[in-house]
């Protein structure tokens, strides 16, 4: 699987999950989140050659098409597969509120 | 929706479904399929700017991150959303066999 366990410990050139830290204030302009100040969101990057973690029948076909037509702009793309939530704390007035933000952290990628 | 109805009738620069015809023999090297000779597979292409048909909370965050950090390599990617099957005919000996290939045709795209 193209997950953090594999990708963070290898020098994989093809589609894999990469490290990315997002600072809520600096990178998103969100000043109201109290904790955390930012988080390891990660992102997906890398080419999707034929047979590399292909998601559907279509992505297999497209990767094969791409192999036969190397100059084509049609190719599978490396995108998130498994996403995890992130708990945040913010203040509503002086009262702290905990909220679970769904689908915020990339754990693995796929070629789609 | 970034579907064939909208995308094929517009000059949309952002993520949208584009026309692509795949010839089984020429483009994939598949000589065994009797009918059809090829099909309109389509593909997804175009940038995924902030607010453009974003798939998950994560893709919204990443697009916003990208807006604040234009040089970053982390950005959502335009990939298939709705896929449709394709019926094919091939011969097993002299007996024609009809098979439904699932997820073969792109009907719409999303930013993931």
């Amino acid at each position: 699987a193209l997950d953090t366990n594999y990708c963070f410990s290898s020098t994989e050139k093809n589609c894999c999950v990469r490290q990315l830290y997002i600072d809520f204030r600096k990178d998103l302009g969100w000043k109201w989140i109290h904790e955390p100040k930012g988080y390891h969101a990660n992102f997906c990057l890398g080419p999707c050659p034929y047979i590399w973690s292909l998601d559907t029948q279509y992505s297999k076909v497209l990767a094969l098409y791409n192999q036969h037509n190397p100059g084509a702009s049609a190719a599978p793309c490396c995108v998130p597969q498994a996403l995890e939530p992130l708990p945040i704390v913010y203040y509503v007035g002086r009262k702290p509120k905990v909220e679970q933000l769904s689908n915020m952290i990339v754990r693995s990628c796929k070629c789609s | 929706a970034l579907d064939t109805n909208y995308c094929f009738s517009s000059t949309e620069k952002n993520c949208c479904v584009r026309q692509l015809y795949i010839d089984f023999r020429k483009d994939l090297g598949w000589k065994w399929i009797h009918e059809p000779k090829g099909y309109h597979a389509n593909f997804c292409l175009g940038p995924c700017p902030y607010i453009w048909s974003l798939d998950t909370q994560y893709s919204k965050v990443l697009a916003l991150y990208n807006q604040h950090n234009p040089g970053a390599s982390a950005a959502p990617c335009c990939v298939p959303q709705a896929l449709e099957p394709l019926p094919i005919v091939y011969y097993v000996g002299r007996k024609p066999k009809v098979e439904q290939l699932s997820n073969m045709i792109v009907r719409s795209c999303k930013c993931s």
Partner: antibody, heavy 121, light 111 residues
């Protein structure tokens, strides 16, 4: 420049629902909280609740809990406020207003022009 | 809910007068070194306009004749020299507690 443009006046019957829209421009819609405030004729201001467009997070005034729903469409930078089971005392001007952004509950620096909702049988 | 009591509810004044409006919160609105109190101006048929935020900070574009002061439960909005365009209703607002609440308003009329 920042602009919040609201939908037009509505006349509704008691028991019906109303959905008011607020189209934002001139700033990053998903980076600030959007509030809804109402004002009955000749009365003061009353905060109804708020939504953070990027996440869909909401905080509602308990007075309206269960009767109000705030949503957004980030593709069009539009916020919506739906109020159900309307009564005659819901007759008011409804405003959307952008929070200044340091906190969830905050001061509001830009306001829509207001939408008059009249509830009458 | 935190109750916000404004006084007076209305006042008559002349151009050039110094005008003071007070707002009392039913409990302290101080937190983390800030006073979570704001002031707005509203003219008939128009939306409110933010004048002062966090008790004493002048909103961008607001004339310097407007000022705010106070902490804890007692706050003041002062207009140093009333101008014709200042005749309006003024509201205070707290955001220390959910729900956010406004004062009942002070109407400033021409004498």
């Amino acid at each position: 420049q920042v602009q919040l443009v609201q939908s037009g006046a509505e006349v509704k019957k008691p028991g019906a629902s109303v959905k008011v829209s607020c189209k934002a421009s001139g700033y990053t819609f998903t980076s600030e909280w959007m509030n809804w405030v109402r004002q009955a004729p000749g009365q003061g201001l009353e905060w109804m609740g708020q939504i953070f467009p990027a996440l869909g997070s909401t905080n509602y005034n308990e007075m309206y809990e269960g009767r109000v729903t705030m949503t957004t469409d980030t593709s069009t930078s539009t916020a919506y406020m739906e109020l159900r089971s309307l009564r005659s005392d819901d007759t008011a001007v409804y405003y959307c207003a952008r929070g200044i952004g340091n906190y969830a509950l905050d001061a509001m620096d830009y306001w829509g022009q207001g939408t008059l909702v009249t509830v009458s049988s | 809910d935190i109750q916000m009591t404004q006084s007076p509810s209305s006042l008559s004044a002349s151009v050039g007068d110094r005008v003071t409006i007070t707002c009392r919160a039913s409990e302290s609105v101080d937190f983390y070194g800030n006073s979570f109190m704001h002031w707005y101006q509203q003219k008939p048929g128009k939306a409110p306009k933010l004048l002062i935020y966090l008790a004493s900070n002048l909103e961008s574009g607001v004339p310097s004749r407007f000022s705010g002061s106070g902490s804890g439960t007692d706050f003041t909005l002062t207009i140093s020299s009333l101008q014709p365009e200042d005749f309006a209703t003024y509201y205070c607002q707290q955001n220390i507690e959910d729900p956010l609440t406004f004062g009942g308003g002070t109407k400033v009329e021409i004498k």
